[in-house]
Amino acid sequence: GITQSPKYLFRKEGQNVTLSCEQNLNHDAMYWYRQDPGQGLRLIYYSQIVNDFQKGDIAEGYSVSREKKESFPLTVTSAQKNPTAFYLCASSI
Amino acid sequence: QLLEQSPQFLSIQEGENLTVYCNSSSVFSSLQWYRQEPGEGPVLLVTVVTGGEVKKLKRLTFQFGDARKDSSLHITAAQTGDTGLYLCAG
């Protein structure tokens, strides 16, 4: 399956926090979305192959890495002034 | 805007080809195909956007009808790993 952690996270002002996303499905593609209350999903970053990732619609204030097929961590940087949201990770073949 | 999928159930031998269909009376700007394995969330396989579009994903071929009302998923030489629930969404 695909696993995200932590389930809940509080961030101190000016801090960077990293959300983990791991999958054991052998999927090449991984995605990070942000969902604000009452809104749909908005794409932050996506990766279709190891060692490569591309910006989605709202990449400002976020960073990612894809060093392994199984893992696609998302860092919410201190530059993201409005980080409060529901974050979803997805994968596909 | 109801989407109808057929067939509802399909059981085939390894190595055989199969096609599943997704039809609607309405026009869709895009259609998505998902695969869901028991106890897991649906996994997005592909999004088709352009009428008449064909997308290939390894042994999977997706087609979007010219009128953007129907789509098909064709699997060549099916393997046991292809077992699952295939969902069409728009």
């Epitope: 090449d28 279709q48 591309q54 910006k55 073949i93 | 390894k58």
Partner: antibody, heavy 120, light 107 residues
Framework: EVQLQESGPELVKPGASVKMSCKAS????????MHWVKQSHGKSLEWIGY????????NYNQKFKGKATLTVNKSSSTAYMELRSLTSEDSAVYFC?????????????WGQGTSVTVSS | DIVMTQSPASLSMAIGEKVTIRCITI??????MNWYQQKPGEPPKLLFS???TLRPGVPSRFSSSGYGSDFAFTIENMLSEDVADYYC?????????FGAGTKLELK
């Protein structure tokens, strides 16, 4: 029918730069990645990098960072590769080749190649 | 980078013989292996893409197998038109990497 038409052969001096082109037709240029591959005489193939013409995203083989620059002109459906600070090691045939964006496929259509000779 | 070990480097076969080329990777690449044929003065031609998928128009005497780190490309009954260089390519990981190639000649 998908076609990739590359520019003609180049004879350049060491230290100079060269910019080659690859004109795409027969498909929607912005839908697919454009890759560049090097083949030295009698040798294997080396992947240089790719560009996504839709958003200009590039990814380079570390070996070619600083050597190659990939760009596109969407209005003319043309991809370009510039090679700088040329040495005899850069003498080779360079291919452009496309791959679909989703999923990340291998290159399925290739240009005929551009021959670059670096000589004083 | 994923290193691709392709063997043999060259091969001399008679018409009708079975040809097998192998490619071994240092890490598991699932089924993200591709095979190309290149004839003199021409660009490479994709024969098999990821998942051992035969490309349109490629003769059925060609086959591809393997998963993980050990892959094979086979020509069942060699014809004179199969004389060419053959390359494997992994598309699991950037940078994409090719095997060193196999030169197939006629005996």
């Amino acid at each position: 029918e998908v076609q990739l038409q590359e520019s003609g052969p180049e004879l350049v001096k060491p230290g100079a730069s060269v910019k080659m082109s690859c004109k795409a037709s027969g498909y929607t240029f912005t839908d697919d990645n454009m890759h560049w591959v090097k083949q030295s005489h009698g040798k294997s193939l080396e992947w240089i990098g790719y560009i996504n013409p839709n958003n200009n995203h590039t990814n380079y083989n570390q070996k070619f960072k600083g050597k190659a620059t990939l760009t596109v002109n969407k209005s003319s459906s043309t991809a370009y590769m510039e090679l700088r600070s040329l040495t005899s090691e850069d003498s080779a045939v360079y291919f452009c080749a496309r791959s679909t964006v989703v999923p990340f496929y291998a290159m399925d259509y290739w240009g005929q190649g551009t021959s670059v000779t670096v000589s004083s | 980078d994923i290193v691709m070990t392709q063997s043999p480097a060259s091969l001399s076969m008679a018409i009708g013989e079975k040809v097998t080329i192998r490619c071994i990777t240092i890490t598991d690449i699932d089924d993200d292996m591709n095979w190309y044929q290149q004839k003199p003065g021409e660009p490479p031609k994709l024969l098999f893409s990821e998942g051992n998928t035969l490309r349109p128009g490629v003769p059925s005497r060609f086959s591809s197998s393997g998963y993980g780190s050990d892959f094979a490309f086979t020509i069942e009954n060699m014809l004179s038109e199969d004389v060419a260089d053959y390359y494997c390519l992994q598309s699991d990981n950037l940078p994409l990497t090719f095997g060193a190639g196999t030169k197939l000649e006629l005996k």
